[in-house]
Amino acid sequence: FERTRSLQDPCSNCPAGTFCDNNRNQICSPCPPNSFSSAGGQRTCDICRQCKGVFRTRKECSSTSNAECDCTPGFHCLGAGCSMCEQDCKQGQELTKKGCKDCCFGTFNDQKRGICRPWTNCSLDGKSVLVNGTKERDVVCGPSPADLSPGASSVTPPAPAREPGHSPQ
């Protein structure tokens, strides 16, 4: 099939980094500057991505592969292939419609990206708050309130070996 295709379509012989030039009798011409073709048999070369402004060049464009961008300091990549750059915020903040804003009371963000998340509700697990939460840190849950009552051991006793109610023989 490949041999048949190459007989029918001379363009299939054009390697990556070239294009099949219809204006020149389907000769394989090199991709012009600032363009590339990553596969053979292409009739056009693709324009290289330009990393400008908030985008920085991580890998230069070549005749066979596109440029790759990352983000300038103070920003981080979002999306496949770093299709977007999003501003970093400080820990304890989130990026809103008006820029970086402090997390509301009861929420935290321990990273420079993402949204503020609610503190863990320790009581849902029957536990108490050991360390209070802040804008930057979640609460730390400790033992349940019952475990901390006077006279109670903080270590859970081992389960009995026999079923309760059975006296030893």
Epitope: R49, K52, G53, V54, F55, C69, F75, L78, G79, C82, S83, M84, C85, E86, Q87, L95, T96, K97, K98, G99, C100
Partner: nanobody, 122 residues
Framework: QVQLVESGGGLVQPGGSLRLSCAAS????????MSWARQAPGKDFEWVSY???????YYADSVKGRFTISRDNAKNTVYLQMNSLKPEDTAVYYC????????????????WGQGTQVTVSS
């Protein structure tokens, strides 16, 4: 071919004013949101101001009350009027399109100018 060309930068004393212009061509300016951003030497890149196609605006806290962004769709130009300038406003100022409409976020389809230097010093 899309072009954004900034002008109006220069040296100004603290407390002084400058008006930056960004002349746009090669795309439908009137329906495009636009932005100004800046990068000071040794500092992180930061957004300064945005203007929607309908004229609504956003400002970074650091420039609020001192800078004004505006646009003239008939001239395909966006402006940044900078008053009460401070030494910390010294930076290269960039004009860019703004597809994401999310503050602090640009995407790969946005176009950028080459930047204009603003220096605030006595």
């Amino acid at each position: 071919q899309v072009q954004l060309v900034e002008s109006g930068g220069g040296l100004v004393q603290p407390g002084g004013s400058l008006r930056l212009s960004c002349a746009a061509s090669g795309f439908t300016f009137s329906s495009s949101a636009m932005s100004w951003a800046r990068q000071a030497p040794g500092k992180d890149f930061e957004w300064v101001s945005y203007i929607y196609s309908d004229g609504n605006t956003y400002y970074a806290d650091s420039v609020k009350g001192r800078f004004t962004i505006s646009r003239d769709n008939a001239k395909n130009t966006v402006y940044l009027q900078m008053n009460s300038l401070k030494p910390e406003d010294t930076a290269v100022y960039y004009c860019a399109t703004w597809h994401t409409l999310r503050v602090g976020v640009w995407d790969e389809y946005d176009y950028w100018g080459q930047g204009t230097q603003v220096t605030v010093s006595s």
